[in-house]
Interface confidence: low
């Protein structure tokens, strides 16, 4: 009870208490991605491992078809890291050749889908220009923050280019959420 | 109690409640590292400040010999940032000279050691190619996620090159964990 | 109650229980910044949206004048991401011209101000050299960790150059804290 062990003698309304161990939680890890058709100007969603290795879902937090399904309204901490890897971005050559100097980039978006809303909501975005002078490059983008979610909301992770995602190890690319 | 203030009149089993203030927690901050011998193909572990400045351990979470010792089974949020700094990576020169074009890199790994397991488990990895055209470079790698840990598990932070770690300020390089 | 549902028959002292839903929490999102005068060698503070879109403050956590005001002592998880964007850093040209080869950089600091302390405390710093060979560049710096705060402490986010902050989208640049 709020601030003391037993209910006070005078009548008072308290927020309900709940055990931490039964809160919805999930940590999902990367699996090999398959090229999927996606709409123009819409980043493809990653799919995830949800029970092997380090991955788990618990307390009614379910993973299905690229989405984490929120089973209970409340404030959630949501996080993801995506490690990208690729061959040299040719931006320096592009620049020298006088072509448009928009750099290559890598982007991660954590998106919320609410069935009653026509449009998904972008909760978090990490975006980075990639202009490497070496040959093979690799780097992570990490995101994490707290959001008020409603029962039935769905969360997914979208990336700018699915072919650049490093799917080789579960500790490099991951996605999770837990009720606070 | 789950969803209501007092136990219902009918018999029901609840997960135990516990005060948030007595949960195991730690935030460790960087100290100057001493070069240590480490096995080939095994990244060296950082050691940490655990009680001065911003650093603390509490509620049976103990720090000893580079390890955070988990005192209680449960789901923990674990995080670390390591700021690296160095002189120019010569990858552009390497590339020009026709030598193998594998870039230089910096890597942070948060590792779990369980005494009953022969091998450590890599929980989180942040790895980045470093191919800077300027001279002195510096940059952080941040990691954080939730894991189910067992009492007696030990956590450490390993890095690819201990000599590149910026140990000058407690806000630049740190490591922490807390029971959810 | 700690480890069991009802108070044991023998007298024992417990830390108070409290409902998770009434803990101080805030997630603030970027707004367009107005150039402000700041002291030499002191990074300017960002100001934030606290109630529109994804932003919120709740349970006595208030935002005022660039500061999050801590209403209750305890351990807080604090996080921020700042996305920077700019034109090409001329560090490669600087290097070629023989001028000092200190690279350009971008820095984020989460700072705590305690009225009884003369100096602010830097809790977290993310700092990165910027030496891009492409033209327009953009990249995020993410920070997050746990700190023991006192009632009345104030938190702010400082950046090395306010003109480089990407204020265009609430998911790119944000700042939050919640009581654990």
């Amino acid at each position: 009870l709020k601030g003391q062990e037993f209910a006070p003698s005078h009548q008072q309304v308290y927020a309900p208490l709940r055990a931490d161990g039964d809160k919805p939680r999930a940590h999902l890890t990367v699996v090999r991605q398959t090229p999927t058709q996606h709409f123009k100007n819409q980043f493809p969603a990653l799919h995830w491992e949800h029970e092997l290795g380090l991955a788990f879902t618990k307390n009614r937090m379910n993973y299905t078809n690229k989405f984490l399904l929120i089973p209970e309204s409340g404030d959630y901490f949501i996080y993801s890291q995506v490690t990208f890897r690729g061959m040299t971005s040719e931006c320096s050559e592009i620049r020298q050749a006088g072509r448009p100097n928009k750099p290559d980039s890598i982007t991660v978006v954590i998106t919320k889908v609410t069935d009653s809303y026509p449009e998904p909501t972008q909760l978090l975005m990490g975006t980075k220009s990639v202009c490497e002078v070496g040959s093979n490059w690799f780097q992570p983008i990490y995101l994490g923050a707290m959001f008020s979610l409603q029962e039935g909301d769905k969360l997914m992770v979208n990336v700018s280019d699915i072919s650049l995602v490093d799917y080789t190890k579960e500790d490099k690319t991951f996605f999770g959420a837990f009720l606070l | 109690l789950k969803g209501q203030e007092f136990a219902p009149s009918h018999q029901q089993v609840y997960a135990p409640l516990r005060a948030d203030g007595d949960k195991p927690r730690a935030h460790l901050t960087v100290v100057r590292q001493t070069p240590t011998q480490h096995f080939k193909n095994q990244f060296p572990a950082l050691h940490w400040e655990h009680e001065l400045g911003l650093a603390f351990t509490k509620n049976r979470m103990n720090y000893t010999n580079k390890f955070l010792l988990i005192p209680e089974s449960g789901d923990y949020f674990i995080y670390s940032q390591v700021t690296f700094r160095g002189m120019t990576s010569e990858c552009s020169e390497i590339r020009q000279a026709g030598r193998p074009n594998k870039p230089d890199s910096i890597t942070v790994v948060i590792t779990k050691v369980t005494d009953s397991y022969p091998e450590p488990t890599q929980l989180l990895m942040g790895t980045k190619s470093v191919c800077e055209v300027g001279s002195n470079w510096f940059q952080p790698i941040y990691l954080g996620a939730m894991f189910s840990l067992q009492e007696g598990d030990k956590l450490m932070v390993n890095v690819s090159d201990i000599s590149l770690v910026d140990y000058t300020k407690e806000d630049k390089t740190f490591f922490g964990a807390f029971l959810l | 109650l700690k480890g069991q549902e009802f108070a044991p028959s023998h007298q024992q002292v417990y830390a108070p229980l409290r409902a998770d839903g009434d803990k101080p929490r805030a997630h603030l999102t970027v707004v367009r910044q107005t150039p402000t005068q700041h002291f030499k060698n002191q990074f300017p503070a960002l100001h934030w949206e606290h109630e529109l879109g994804l932003a919120f403050t709740k349970n006595r956590m208030n935002y005022t004048n660039k500061f999050l005001l801590i209403p209750e002592s305890g351990d807080y998880f604090i996080y921020s991401q700042v996305t920077f964007r700019g034109m090409t850093s001329e560090c490669s040209e600087i290097r070629q011209a023989g001028r000092p080869n200190k690279p350009d950089s971008i820095t984020v600091v989460i700072t705590k101000v305690t009225d009884s302390y003369p100096e602010p405390t830097q809790l977290l710093m993310g700092t990165k050299s910027v030496c891009e060979v492409g033209s327009n560049w953009f990249q995020p710096i993410y920070l997050g960790a746990m700190f023991s705060l006192q009632e009345g402490d104030k938190l702010m986010v400082n950046v090395s150059d306010i003109s480089l902050v990407d204020y265009t989208k609430e998911d790119k640049t944000f700042f939050g804290a919640f009581l654990l």
Partner: antibody
Framework: QVQLQESGPGLVRPSQTLSLTCTVS????????IHWVRQRPGRGLEWMGR????????KYNPSLKSRVTITRDTSKNQVSLRLSSVTAADTAVYYC?????????WGQGSLVTVSS | DIQMTQSPSSLSASVGDRVTITCRAS?????MYWYQQKPGKAPKDLIY???NLASGVPSRFSGSGSGTDFTFTISSLQPEDIATYYC?????????FGQGTKVEIK
């Protein structure tokens, strides 16, 4: 090219431990998962478990968990399977397979007969 | 456990025929995988992630489906397609296979 090769004794006594080794080449062991799958005579395929050679993370088929152990030696590019307390019902062709999210290459298989 | 029910268990068709095999999962899964196994040989990857053709696999093989119901099709059966075909899901633990469909030529 990618190759996986199972090796080990073809005959194991009942109640003993079956031991097989999968030696791989043509790819970096640490970039994949390695699975063990078996096929009993005239039967279908049964997934036994998998290891992430980079981290040592394991997952086993619950029906075999008490008897199966998978280990790896990345320096030798090898993954090993041990199945304890075998009976005639464990007579099968044992395959190791590589995946990066889905199984994509298999060894040719190793027939193990359990008999006294 | 996620149970995989494959049907038919065997079929006989003529060269050039269209052959369809179905696989039903006891719970919804994101993706299905299909393998071909010839007598005395190891299984071979045919279709990954429901509908993607593995490297070097002829285009007469295809896969489709979602949720709990998945289909594997050979658009024009060839003599070299005589084999047993297996579906597999890899989301649940254990990663279960269907019981197989033996394809023969009439």
């Amino acid at each position: 090219q990618v190759q996986l090769q199972e090796s080990g004794p073809g005959l194991v006594r009942p109640s003993q431990t079956l031991s097989l080794t999968c030696t791989v080449s043509g790819f970096d062991l640490q970039d994949t998962y390695i699975h063990w799958v078996r096929q009993r005579p005239g039967r279908g395929l049964e997934w036994m478990g998998r290891i992430d050679p980079a981290s040592g993370h394991l997952k086993y088929n619950p029906s075999l968990k008490s008897r199966v152990t998978i280990t790896r030696d990345t320096s030798k590019n090898q993954v090993s399977l041990r199945l304890s307390s075998v009976t005639a019902a464990d007579t099968a062709v044992y395959y190791c397979a590589r995946s990066g999210g889905m199984t994509d290459y298999w060894g040719q298989g190793s027939l193990v007969t359990v008999s006294s | 456990d996620i149970q995989m029910t494959q049907s038919p268990s065997s079929l006989s068709a003529s060269v050039g025929d269209r052959v369809t095999i179905t696989c039903r999962a006891s719970f919804s899964v994101d993706y299905m995988y299909w393998y071909q196994q010839k007598p005395g040989k190891a299984p071979k990857d045919l279709i990954y992630a429901t509908s993607n053709l593995a490297s070097g696999v002829p285009s007469r093989f295809s896969g489709s489906g979602s949720g709990t119901d998945f289909t594997f099709t050979i658009s024009s059966l060839q003599p070299e397609d005589i084999a047993t075909y297996y579906c597999q899901q890899w989301e649940g633990n254990p990663r279960s296979f269907g019981q197989g469909t033996k394809v023969e030529i009439k």
